[in-house]
C-alpha cells in the first residue's frame, strides 16, 4: 500500500514482561513485534550501546522476521538492559528489557509432595506409582521394594532388605523411570515402595505402600515371603 506509516508495535502483549530473571545456561528470547511502511529495520543495544556479536561468547541470533533477539546459554556477564530500536524513514520506536541471570545453587533432588501415593488394588489388578523429580543436576532415579527374607525386613546388620525394581539406564527416559507399573498384582507385591533420586549433592526419597486385597469372591491366598534379594 502507499500509506506511509512510522513504526508501531503489533503485539504489545508479548512485550509486557520487561524484567527477565533467567537461570544461567538457559536461552533468552526478547521480542519487539512491529509494523510500518516501509517495513522498519530493527537493531539492538545493550546498556544503551550498539550490541555487537563479539560482545558475548557465542554471539547471538537476530530473527528479523520474528522481531527477536536470541541469546543461548546465558552467563552472568549477559546481565543488563537490552533495547530494541525499530525505525524507518518516518520514525523510530524503542523498547527496553532488563535481563538478570540467576546462578542457581544446585540442590538435592526435590520430590513432589504426596508422590508416590499409597495405593490399593485387588489380586490380579494393575497399579502404578508415580514419582516427580526436580533436580538441577541430572538425577539418577531408582524404584526400590522393601522385601522380607526369612520373615524379617532387616538383616543382621540392621539394614533393610531391598530389591531394585527399576533404575534409569541407557535406554530409559526420565519420563519412563518416573512411573512404576505393577501388572497382575499378587499378595507378594504388597508392601513399601520407594522412589529414590540422587544427584551430586545428595539423595532424596519418598515411599508409598501398596495394599493388596483379595479378589471379590475369592479366598485370600496364603503366600510365602520372598527369599531373594537383588
Amino acid at each position: 500500500s502507499n500509506n506511509k506509516r512510522a513504526p508501531y508495535w503489533t503485539n504489545t502483549e508479548k512485550m509486557e514482561k520487561r524484567l527477565h530473571a533467567v537461570p544461567a545456561a538457559n536461552t533468552v528470547k526478547f521480542r519487539c513485534p512491529a509494523g510500518g511502511n516501509p517495513m522498519p529495520t530493527m537493531r539492538w543495544l545493550k546498556n544503551g550501546k550498539e550490541f555487537k556479536q563479539e560482545h558475548r561468547i557465542g554471539g547471538y541470533k537476530v530473527r528479523n522476521q520474528h522481531w527477536s533477539l536470541i541469546m543461548e546459554s546465558v552467563v552472568p556477564s549477559d546481565k543488563g538492559n537490552y533495547t530494541c530500536v525499530v525505525e524507518n524513514e518516518y520514525g523510530s520506536i524503542n523498547h527496553t528489557y532488563h535481563l538478570d541471570v540467576v546462578e542457581r545453587s544446585p540442590h538435592r533432588p526435590i520430590l513432589q509432595a504426596g508422590l508416590p501415593a499409597n495405593a490399593s488394588t485387588v489380586v490380579g489388578g494393575d497399579v502404578e506409582f508415580v514419582c516427580k523429580v526436580y533436580s538441577d543436576a541430572q538425577p539418577h532415579i531408582q524404584w526400590i521394594k522393601h522385601v522380607e527374607k526369612n520373615g524379617s525386613k532387616y538383616g543382621p546388620d540392621g539394614l533393610p532388605y531391598l530389591k531394585v525394581l527399576k533404575a534409569a539406564g541407557v535406554n530409559t527416559t526420565d519420563k519412563e523411570i518416573e512411573v512404576l507399573y505393577i501388572r497382575n498384582v499378587t499378595f507378594e507385591d504388597a508392601g513399601e515402595y520407594t522412589c529414590l533420586a540422587g544427584n551430586s549433592i545428595g539423595i532424596s526419597f519418598h515411599s508409598a505402600w501398596l495394599t493388596v486385597l483379595p479378589a471379590p469372591g475369592r479366598e485370600k491366598e496364603i503366600t510365602a515371603s520372598p527369599d531373594y534379594l537383588e
Epitope: 545453587s105 544446585p106 540442590h107 538435592r108 526435590i110 520430590l111 513432589q112 509432595a113 543436576a137 541430572q138 539418577h140 531408582q142 526400590i144 539394614l159 533393610p160 531391598l162 531394585v164 520407594t194 529414590l196 540422587g198 544427584n199 551430586s200 549433592i201 545428595g202 539423595i203 532424596s204 526419597f205 519418598h206
Partner: antibody, heavy 124, light 112 residues
C-alpha cells in the same frame, strides 16, 4: 577398610599450578560423588568442589571457580583437583570426602569418610 | 549461599557436665523429603573432621549416645550430656542441602 588418601600437596609460588590426588579404597568408588574441602591454617572448613559419580556434573565454590578443576578416573579409583593460578589465600589443608552414593542409603548420604588431608602452601 | 552461624566461639566445660552448641542457618534446611540436612562434626587436633550427627538428629555409627542433635528448620543444637576429656576439639555444623555446602565457623570445646 574404607579409606581416602590425598597426595600432591607442597609449596608453590603464586600464579603456579598444582594437582592433588585422592586415592580411594575399600568401597565402590565409581558409585559415589566426591568432594574437596579445605581448611586454611587456624581457620574453619570451606567446601571447594564436588563431582558426580560418573564425572558428568561438577560444581565449585565461587572462590575457586575458573581456576580449579575437579576430575576423576574411576578405573584408577582416584579423584583429582587441578589448581591453577594459585593465590596466597589458597594455602590450606585439602581434604577429599566421600559424597552421596547412587543407591538407597541407610545412614548418611555423604561426608562420612574423609582423607587425612594434604597441605598446600602458596608462597613466594 | 546459605550462611551457617555457630555460637559460642569457645566453650570450657567441667568433665561430667553438659555442653550445648548452637547453629543457625540463613535458610530452612528442611527438605521436601521431610529430612533436615544439618550435619555435625568434631575435629580433633591434627585430624580430619569426624561425623557425629547427620540429618539433624541421627547419631553416626560408633558415636557415643552422650551426643545428640536437635532443632528445626533454621535453629539447631548439638548437646553433649556429660563431657569427657576425649571430647576436646572444634565442633562444626554443616548444611548439606545445596551447593555451595557451607560450614559454621566452629566452636572450640576445652576441658576446665
Amino acid at each position: 577398610e574404607v579409606q581416602l588418601v590425598e597426595s600432591g600437596g607442597g609449596v608453590v609460588q603464586p600464579g603456579r599450578s598444582l594437582r592433588l590426588s585422592c586415592a580411594a579404597s575399600g568401597f565402590t568408588f565409581s558409585s559415589y560423588a566426591m568432594h574437596w574441602v579445605r581448611q586454611a591454617p587456624g581457620k574453619g572448613l570451606e567446601w571447594v568442589a564436588v563431582i558426580s559419580y560418573d564425572g558428568s556434573n561438577k560444581y565449585y565454590a565461587d572462590s575457586v571457580k575458573g581456576r580449579f578443576t575437579i576430575s576423576r578416573d574411576n578405573s584408577k579409583n582416584t579423584l583429582y583437583l587441578q589448581m591453577n593460578s594459585l593465590r596466597a589465600e589458597d594455602t590450606a589443608v585439602y581434604y577429599c570426602a566421600r559424597g552421596a552414593g547412587r543407591g538407597y542409603t541407610y545412614g548418611p548420604d555423604g561426608f562420612d569418610i574423609w582423607g587425612q588431608g594434604t597441605m598446600v602452601t602458596v608462597s613466594s | 549461599d546459605i550462611v551457617m552461624t555457630q555460637t559460642p566461639l569457645s566453650l570450657s566445660v567441667t568433665p561430667g557436665q553438659p555442653a550445648s552448641i548452637s547453629c543457625t542457618s540463613s535458610r530452612s534446611l528442611l527438605h521436601s523429603d521431610g529430612k533436615t540436612y544439618v550435619y555435625w562434626y568434631v575435629q580433633k587436633s591434627g585430624q580430619p573432621p569426624q561425623l557425629l550427627i547427620y540429618e539433624l538428629s541421627n547419631r553416626f555409627s560408633g558415636v557415643p549416645d552422650r551426643f545428640s542433635g536437635s532443632g528445626s528448620r533454621t535453629d539447631f543444637t548439638l548437646k553433649i550430656s556429660r563431657v569427657e576429656a576425649e571430647d576436646v576439639g572444634v565442633y562444626y555444623c554443616m548444611q548439606y542441602i545445596e551447593a555451595p555446602l557451607t560450614f559454621g565457623g566452629g566452636t572450640k570445646v576445652e576441658i576446665k
